[in-house]
Each structure stands twice: as structure tokens, then as C-alpha cells.
């Protein structure tokens, strides 16, 4: 009686179980009662990443420099090429089909997490006692100057965008 289901790494064709082609190879011809499944390796710049019965290998992804992409990991016959973004850019999606520039943190905000090729800059507001006076994709909030440790007094309080202004002790109101 012909099988209705096959073992793992097999497929059902013409009422019989044939072996699937291993990753990195494509199907040339199905097995018969007398012959094994015929498979051929994928060509240059092609891949198949699973046990399969595909008659065509997939093309490796092209990391288009015009979209800000570069190769992070070269593809093999069993894996696709992995693209990432050029310095200063990050992917717009998980599949990384294009890139956009990293966001800068505005004055009053500091960098909480520096951007990577796949994630944007994460900014956070500078709390009291800290400031940032620049737009930057790298700078954290900086602490206000301690006038006391310099034997000076605060002449002007700091803000989230400006440092404290220190002055001599005698300038007391």
C-alpha cells in the first residue's frame, strides 16, 4: 500500500517517499522506484537554507550601496547575505532593505543608547543637575560644574541645556 506520509527530510511524490535535497542544493529530478533523488549544488551567489525540493536556488540579497547598505556577512550556498548599514546609518526594517541616518539628540537631551547598524539612537531628557548644549548622536547629558569644589559660587543656575555659571565668593547679593 502506498504511503500517505513520509519521514523527516522526505517528501511524497507519485505515491512514494523521496529524499529532500540538503541545504545548499536544489532538486534536479525526483526519485523513482529505482533511483535516488537527484540534487545539484547552488551556483555562485545563490543559496537554499533548508532541506528542500526547490528546482531553483534563491539569489543572494544585494546590499545596494546607493541605499546605504553594505555586506555584514557574505552569503554561502546555505545562507543568504546579511546586509547592514554604513557608519552613521541604521536599517529601516528588520530585513534591512534600506538605511536612514541616525537621529541626533537635541539640546536638553542626551544619548541613552548609541545607534547601531540596526537600531536608532535612543535619547533621554537631561534631568536636573545635568545638561546637553549640543545636537549629537553620541553625547550623553553632562553634569553641571560643581562651583563649590572650585571654591566658587553659582552666579547663574544651570538648565537642561546650559551649565552652571560659577563666580567668585564675594559676588553675594
Amino acid at each position: 500500500e502506498p504511503p500517505t506520509a513520509c519521514r523527516e527530510k522526505q517528501y511524497l511524490i507519485n505515491s512514494q517517499c523521496c529524499s529532500l535535497c540538503q541545504p545548499g542544493q536544489k532538486l534536479v529530478s525526483d526519485c523513482t522506484e529505482f533511483t535516488e533523488t537527484e540534487c545539484l549544488p547552488c551556483g555562485e551567489s545563490e543559496f537554499l537554507d533548508t532541506w528542500n525540493r526547490e528546482t531553483r536556488c534563491h539569489q543572494h540579497k544585494y546590499c545596494d550601496p546607493n541605499l546605504g547598505l553594505r555586506v555584514q556577512q557574505k552569503g554561502t550556498s546555505e545562507t543568504d547575505t546579511i546586509c547592514t548599514c554604513e557608519e552613521g546609518l541604521h536599517c529601516t526594517s528588520e530585513s534591512c532593505e534600506s538605511c536612514v541616518p541616525h537621529r541626533s539628540c537635541l539640546p536638553g537631551f542626551g544619548v541613552k543608547q548609541i545607534a547601531t547598524g540596526v537600531s536608532d539612537t535612543i535619547c533621554e531628557p537631561c534631568p536636573v543637575g545635568f545638561f546637553s548644549n549640543v545636537s549629537s548622536a553620541f553625547e550623553k547629558c553632562r553634569p553641571w560644574t560643581s562651583c563649590e569644589t572650585k571654591d566658587l559660587v553659582v552666579q547663574q543656575a544651570g538648565t537642561n541645556k546650559t551649565d552652571v555659571v560659577c563666580g567668585p565668593q564675594d559676588r553675594q547679593r
Epitope: V128, G129, C141, A157
Partner: antibody, heavy 122, light 113 residues
């Protein structure tokens, strides 16, 4: 020890101004922020503004901007909060409190004045 | 401005009970550079000025009984009274001091059951 002593209760007419004082002792007045907070009858706490007496630097809550003036006299270690164009909704207890001392790590209010009741009524 | 929301607005409890008050901020009060949480808790009794209990979300102010404790980070914070005493019946406020303007929660009244 740290002490903040406020001026006495006031009754004011709508449209007038009130000036509440807060005399500090037991710490370096000029380098510590003085904060002003108010509490309407049966309501919660509302921050109004603050001053760093040594520099005269101030911060105000937007709600009170233009109507409140906070000043300080370092010679007498006294801070003042003046609220103008009074209306009935300004009836509240007004508190001063000590904020950061220049260490930039003590922004919470660890000492409070006893409060000053301001009643606005025609 | 950072909004502070306390819950519940009132709680009825008996002496010896464990009481938990929560406070939620509209944005994170944790700063990555120093990993500090810019939040304080105050106790206020009728006709009296507020009294500082907890600062930096979990540091106990000098002289405050150890039955009071604070926890939390980011946007969610908790004040716990482990075993309520008669003198603890009061209103409790959370307050952030991350950036101006400072704002308070609306208060939680702890009443006798």
C-alpha cells in the same frame, strides 16, 4: 538645626497682592534652593517656583509665570514669594521648603516651613 | 510636564496592616547615567507641613521608621508601610524631581478602617 519660619496668615481682597516671607536658619542659605509650594483647602500640593538665593536664579511653574515673583535677601536669610492679581482660587496654605544645597543630588524637599494661610475674599 | 498619578486615592486599613501605595509617572524617572530614580514620598497630617519619607525612590530619610520603604524604577513606584501604626494615618504624596516643573501625585489618604 535647619529651620524655615514663615510669616503669619493674611486676608486679601481679589485683585490685590500678597507677599509671604520665609526666614531660614541652621544652614548656608545662599547656596540652597528655596522652593515654594501651595495647597488649596482639601486639595493636593502644587509647586509654584524656586530661587537660588546667592545668584537670584529662579524657576517658575508656567501656571504662575507673570503673576508670581520669588526673591531672596541673603543678608537676612529670608526668601519671599509675592503673588499678584489674587483671585478666590488662590486661597491656600503657602509653604516654603529647602531644595538642593549645591551638591546637585538633593532636589527633594527635606525641610518645610510651617505654612502661611492666605485667604482671598471680598 | 511630567504627570504623576497615585492610586488608590484613599485606603482604609487597620493597625498592623501592610499598606501599598503606587505612583505612576508619565515618563521615565530613571536616568541612565547615574541609574537614579528622581522620586520622593512625603507624609502629611492635617494642619501640618508635609514630611519627607523617601528620596531617590528607595532611600529612607533620616529619622523615618524602617516600616516605610520605597521601590520601583522607570515609571512605576511603590510606597509600602509594612505594619501600619496609629501615627501613620495621614495623606501620602509622591513627587518627581527629574526636571522642572516639579509635580506631585494627587495624594493617597490612609484612613482607619
Amino acid at each position: 538645626q535647619v529651620q524655615l519660619v514663615q510669616s503669619g496668615a493674611e486676608v486679601k481682597k481679589p485683585g490685590s497682592s500678597v507677599k509671604v516671607s520665609c526666614k531660614a536658619s541652621g544652614y548656608t542659605f545662599s547656596t540652597s534652593w528655596i522652593e515654594w509650594i501651595r495647597q488649596a483647602p482639601g486639595q493636593g500640593l502644587e509647586w509654584m517656583g524656586s530661587i537660588l538665593p546667592g545668584s537670584g536664579s529662579t524657576n517658575y511653574a508656567q501656571k504662575f509665570q507673570g503673576r508670581v515673583t520669588i526673591t531672596a535677601d541673603t543678608s537676612t536669610s529670608t526668601a519671599y514669594m509675592e503673588l499678584s492679581s489674587l483671585r478666590s482660587e488662590d486661597t491656600a496654605v503657602y509653604y516654603c521648603a529647602r531644595g538642593d544645597d549645591g551638591s546637585y543630588v538633593r532636589w527633594y524637599f527635606d525641610h518645610w516651613g510651617q505654612g502661611t494661610l492666605v485667604t482671598v475674599s471680598s | 510636564d511630567i504627570q504623576m498619578t497615585q492610586s488608590p486615592s484613599s485606603v482604609s486599613a487597620s493597625v498592623g496592616d501592610r499598606v501599598t501605595i503606587t505612583c505612576r509617572a508619565s515618563q521615565s524617572l530613571t536616568f541612565s547615567v547615574n541609574q537614579k530614580n528622581y522620586l520622593a514620598w512625603y507624609q502629611q497630617k492635617p494642619g501640618k507641613a508635609p514630611k519627607l519619607l523617601i528620596y531617590w525612590a528607595s532611600s529612607l530619610q533620616s529619622g523615618v521608621p524602617s516600616r516605610f520603604s520605597g521601590s520601583g524604577s522607570g515609571t512605576d513606584f511603590t510606597l509600602t508601610i509594612s505594619s501600619l501604626q496609629p501615627e501613620d494615618f495621614a495623606t501620602y504624596y509622591c513627587q518627581h524631581y527629574y526636571s522642572y516643573p516639579w509635580t506631585f501625585g494627587q495624594g493617597t489618604k490612609v484612613e482607619i478602617k
